[in-house]
Each structure stands twice: as C-alpha cells, then as structure tokens.
C-alpha cells in the first residue's frame, strides 16, 4: 500500500510515495518535449543504431494542491511518452506504429527512475506551515511488451536498476533481539 | 507495503534517557517524514515531533524540546527517537509514524513501552 | 495550544448501527483534521484527513465532514472490525494535538 496520489490544480494526479503511475496519455500539446533529457535512448529490440531510436520524456509545471493547500511554487513533473521506436518513425505525437515485425514485442517508454521532492504547502486558516513529499519521474527507459503480457509485465531492456517494482524495497531483517518482527497491520 | 519495526521494551531509572530505533522498510526513509506519538497508559495519544530525514530538518512539540533529538540513519533507514531527564510520567507507549506529510501519519510501528521507575 | 474535545468519550452499539463521533477544536482549525482507529494493543490506523479525505483502503462506510471548530466521524452501518477507539487529531497549528478518544464497544 502506497501514499497517497497528490492532486494538482490541473486535476491530474501527481503520484505520492511509493506510486508508480501509467505513462498518460500520449497527445498533450501543451507539454515541454525534450528527448530523452540528454541521454542517449535505451535499446530496444535488435537495434542497430542507438540513434534510430525514441523515448521521449515531456516535462510541465504545475502548482500541486493537497486539501486547500497549494504549493508555494509550480513542480516540474517529468512524463514518459509513447512507444519506443525508430525516430525517423516517430510523430511529434507518437503514433502506435508496429515498426519490427507484426508478431513481434512492443517496446513502450516507461518511468525509469523516480526522485521524491519536498513541497512547502501555502495552506488558508492554519499558521502552521505544511511540507509534502511527492515522488516524481526522473528518467523514462524502454521496456518490452510482448501481446501475451500484460502491460505490468514490462521486460526491461536498459541496464538494470535495484529500484524494486511499487515502492517495495528488499531489505534485511531489522536488527538485534530487541526488534518486534511482528508485521504491521496499517492496511484494511 | 511499508513496515515499521521498533526496537524492545526498556526500563529506565528517573533522570536517565532512553533511545528507541524504528527501522523502515519498503520505502527509503529519506522519501519520508517521521514523526514520534506517545500514549501514556490508559491515556489518549500524544504528538512529539517530527523529522525529515532528508535534510535532517525537525518540529518539536515544545512540551518536549531541549529534551527530545530526533534523529535517521539514512544508511540502514532507521530513525531514532532519543528522550532524556527522564520522569514517571514519561512512561508510555512510543510509537514511530512515517509518511508523506509533516502533519498526518500514515504508517506506525507497533510501539516501544517506556517504564520509568526507580 | 489548540484543544480537540471528542464527545461521546464512549458509546455502545450494535452491529448495522450508524454511529457518529464528533470532536471539537478550541479554534478555528479550517479542514486540518483527521480521524484515527486504535484497537486494544495495536498501533493507531489512519482513516482520514483533511476533514473529510478517505486514506488508502479504508471502506466507505467510513466518512468524515466538519470544517471550522466542528467535525464528524461517521460510520455508516458498524461492523465488527469496527469496535475500537477512534481519536481526532488537528494540524492547523503546533503543536498537532489529539482529542481524548471515543471508545466503540459492542452493546
């Protein structure tokens, strides 16, 4: 069970912690593109130049709410778009090509690294001030897809990370005698 | 799925201090806020502080500053809670909380018993 | 520092019962409350915030309204895994104080 997802004035969801969100929707022109941040693309399937091919990261601002409260200053969020596939195939809206073979895997541009950033809350009534930490994209990478797999079951192509699928992260056993192993009942 | 597991009971001596652990797993504590909640027996719940780990940021409840450090070992993801000049009445139940915000707490540990008797 | 006074400070009742819980700030606290369960030996579980938000996986027969000094906890039809002690807790100003807690036991 992850954090909650923080809403921002747009009515979009930024994830909170420990979510990791579908890439949205692939046609929203009122986004800043940038390819791939200044890294070179991940390969997909057989490539034969790196350069052919796309995975385009789109980068907007927003305000973030939570409750009432607002962020004193707009977050840069970084999407990842569409498929992965050659550039010189690609669209400035990414279009569903199958550019290998009909049969064969589909490559989608998916989060790749995530970054937690704190927020200062300007929040009407209360005196107190309020911070919130909102998980972010960091990097998009390519990840297969084969038609018998459902979109969960993204076989990575790029170099490995250890950042462990939802949020979970393997750790040892908490230490000393004294630690209560007893797991937490904090979800219904 | 996120899990707080906090070190054992402890007996203390008036004037003493005590230094309970909570290690976080599924999250690292760094990404988080973690906050300190007392229950004296029998009573209601009481707010002690929080800390960002991050940055090594903290908010006391003035009740308890100057005799509260809250501090994390972002290495192992533990935080630790350390209270001094102890008295009976700090007998209690401290729980560790994490989350997202300074202000609410969405995952506890399952709480550290503090007996303070000479 | 702000008072949250909970009242009743125990109830009875059944299974299928409505109940409501209500809890009241000494000053003005906008929407920055929230609602806890704690049962006997555990630790405390999030139910909502911001008066009125529903935190992950709570069910619906959980609901919370109330803004200024008043605020509601209701649970629309109890149901076993309900009886427990329920505390309101604001964040409008330092330091967060908890109300005294409503006790739910089994009539």
């Known amino acids: 069970q992850g954090w909650q997802a923080f809403r921002n004035d747009a009515t979009e969801v930024i994830p909170g912690l420990g979510e990791y969100p579908e890439p949205p929707p692939e046609n929203n022109q009122t986004m800043n593109r940038a390819e791939n941040g200044g890294r070179p693309p991940h390969h997909p399937y057989d490539a034969k130049d790196v350069s052919e091919y796309s995975c385009r990261e789109l980068h907007y601002t927003r305000f973030l709410t939570d409750g009432p409260c607002r962020s004193a200053k707009p977050v840069t969020e970084l999407v990842c778009s569409g498929q992965c596939g050659p550039a010189r195939l690609l669209p400035n809206a990414i279009g569903r090509v199958k550019w290998w073979r009909p049969n064969g895997p589909d490559f989608r541009c998916i989060p790749d690294r995530y970054r937690a950033q704190r927020v200062q809350l300007l929040c009407p009534g209360g005196a107190a001030p309020r911070s919130r930490k909102v998980r972010l994209v960091a990097s998009c990478k390519c990840k297969r897809l084969t038609r018998f797999h459902n979109q969960s079951e993204l076989k990575d192509f790029g170099p490995e990370t250890a950042r462990p699928q939802k949020g979970r992260k393997p750790r040892p056993g908490a230490r000393g005698a004294k630690a209560n192993q007893a797991e937490l009942e904090n979800a219904y | 799925q996120v899990q707080l597991v906090q070190s054992g009971a402890e007996v203390k001596k008036p004037g003493a201090s005590v230094k309970v652990s909570c290690k976080v797993s599924?999250?690292?504590?760094?990404?988080?806020?973690q906050h300190w909640v007392r229950q004296a027996p029998g009573k209601g719940l009481e707010w002690m502080g929080w800390?960002?780990?991050?940055?090594?940021?903290?908010e006391y409840a003035s009740k308890f500053q100057g005799r509260v450090t809250m501090t994390e070992d972002t290495s192992t993801d533990t935080a630790y809670m350390e209270l001094s000049s102890l008295r009976s009445e700090d007998t209690a139940v401290y729980y560790c909380?994490?989350?997202?915000?300074?202000?609410?707490?969405?995952?506890w540990g399952q709480g550290t018993t503090v007996t303070v008797s000479s | 520092d702000i008072q949250m006074t909970q009242s009743p400070s125990s109830l009875s009742a059944s299974v299928g019962d409505r109940v409501t819980i209500t809890c009241k700030a000494s000053?003005?606290?906008?929407?920055?409350v929230a609602w806890y369960q704690q049962k006997p030996g555990k630790a405390p579980k999030l139910l909502i915030y911001?008066?009125?938000t529903r935190w992950t996986g709570v069910p619906s027969r959980f609901s919370g309204s109330g803004s200024g000094t008043d605020f509601t906890l209701t649970i629309s039809s109890l149901q076993p895994e309900d009886f427990a002690t329920y505390y309101c807790?604001?964040?409008?100003?330092?330091?967060?104080?908890f109300g005294g807690g409503t006790k739910v036991e089994i009539k």
């Open positions: 909380a994490t989350g997202d915000t300074t202000y609410k707490f969405d995952f």
């Open positions: 599924g999250f690292p504590i760094k990404d988080t806020f």
């Open positions: 800390s960002d780990p991050e940055i090594g940021d903290t």
């Open positions: 000053q003005d606290v906008h929407t920055a």
């Open positions: 911001w008066a009125s």
């Open positions: 807790q604001q964040y409008s100003d330092y330091p967060w104080t």
